[in-house]
Interface confidence: low
Amino acid sequence: GSERTCCPVNWVEHERSCYWFSRSGKAWADADNYCRLEDAHLVVVTSWEEQKFVQHHIGPVNTWMGLHDQNGPWKWVDGTDYETGFKNWRPEQPDDWYGHGLGGGEDCAHFTDDGRWNDDVCQRPYRWVCETELDKASQEPPLL
C-alpha cells in the first residue's frame, strides 16, 4: 500500500502519529471497529509523553484505549509488548472486578478521570481515541 504522509482531516498529528478523539461513547468492541474502519487502531500508549498528550486532549472523562485481556493476558491491539511496555494503572488495578453485576469480569482498559488506567466492563459506552502512525503503509490498494 501507499505510505501515509499526513494526517486525515480532523485528526491531530503528534510525534509522527495521528490521533482522533471521539466526543460520543461506544462499547470497546465498537470503538475498536470504528478505528479499524479508519485504517487506524485504538490508541496504544508507549510513553509518559504520549500519556500526557492523550490525557490533555481527553480531559477528565473515561476513555477507551487499545488494551484488553479478553483472551487471557493483557495485549495491546497493535502488538506492542505489554509486559515490557509503559503502564499507568491506578493503584489496585487491574482487578478484573466481578462485583458490578453485569456478568463476567473487566477485560478492557480505559483512561480514568485523572488519566490513570482502570479495567472495566467492555460493554460500557465510553469515549475513545484512535491512532494511526505516519509513514506506515495504508491498507489501500496501490494505484495501477
Partner: antibody
Amino acid sequence: QVQLQESGPGLVNPSQTLSLTCGVSGGSISSGYYYWSWIRQHPGKGLEWIGYIYYSGSTYYNPSLKSRVSISLDTPKNQFSLKLTSVTAADTAVYYCARDWGGYDSSGWFDPWGQGTLVTVSS
Amino acid sequence: QSVLTQPPSASGTPGQRVTISCSGSSSNIGNNAVSWYQQLPGTAPKLLIYSNDHRPSGVPDRFSGSKSGTSASLAISGLQSEDEADYYCAAWDDSLKGPVFGGGTKLTVL
C-alpha cells in the same frame, strides 16, 4: 506570560488576499498543548472563529470560510499567519489571534488574545 | 445569525445580581463545555469562565458560570460599574467541527 500581537496591512483591495501575522512572545508555538487561532469581529457585531493550527501543522477551519482560508506556522520566528483570499467588503473586521487551550471539550477556551487589528476591504 | 443565542442586552444597578443566558443545541452546549468572555469597550475579549464553571486566576469570584442541558448561564453578583461590557458565550459544535459563539449581550450598569 504569553502575549500575542497581530500585524499586517489595515487596508486590502477587494478580490485581493488578506495576510496577517501573529507574533507570540513569552511562550513557544511549538508547545504540544495549544492551538493557535484566528477569530474576527465584524464592526458592531459578534465573534466568528476562522480557524486554528496545531504545532505539528494540523489545521482546522470554519466550514464557511474553508475554501478561502489558510493558516500557517513559522516556528523559527515563533509566529503564525492567516491568509484569506478573494476578500470582499464583508471581510472587513477586527482580526484577533488567540491561543486556544485545545484540550478536552475546550476548543473555545481562548486565552490570551492579541489586541486585534482592524482590516478594511475597500478600493 | 449566531449559532448560540444570547439576549442582546441586560442591565442592573450596582450591587445587584445579573444573569445572562446562552442557549444552544445538543451538538454544541448539550455535548460540550461552555466558556464566557468579557469584552470591555475598545479592547479584545478576555476569558472569564471556562469548562462551564471554572474561573481563570485573576477573575473575581463575583463571576460564576453554570450549564444545564443545552443552555448555559453567566451570573454576576455584586454588580460594579466596571462590569459594563459585552459578554459572549462559546462552545465547541460537533456539527460544524469548530467553536461557535453567541451573538453577545451588552450589559449596562445603571
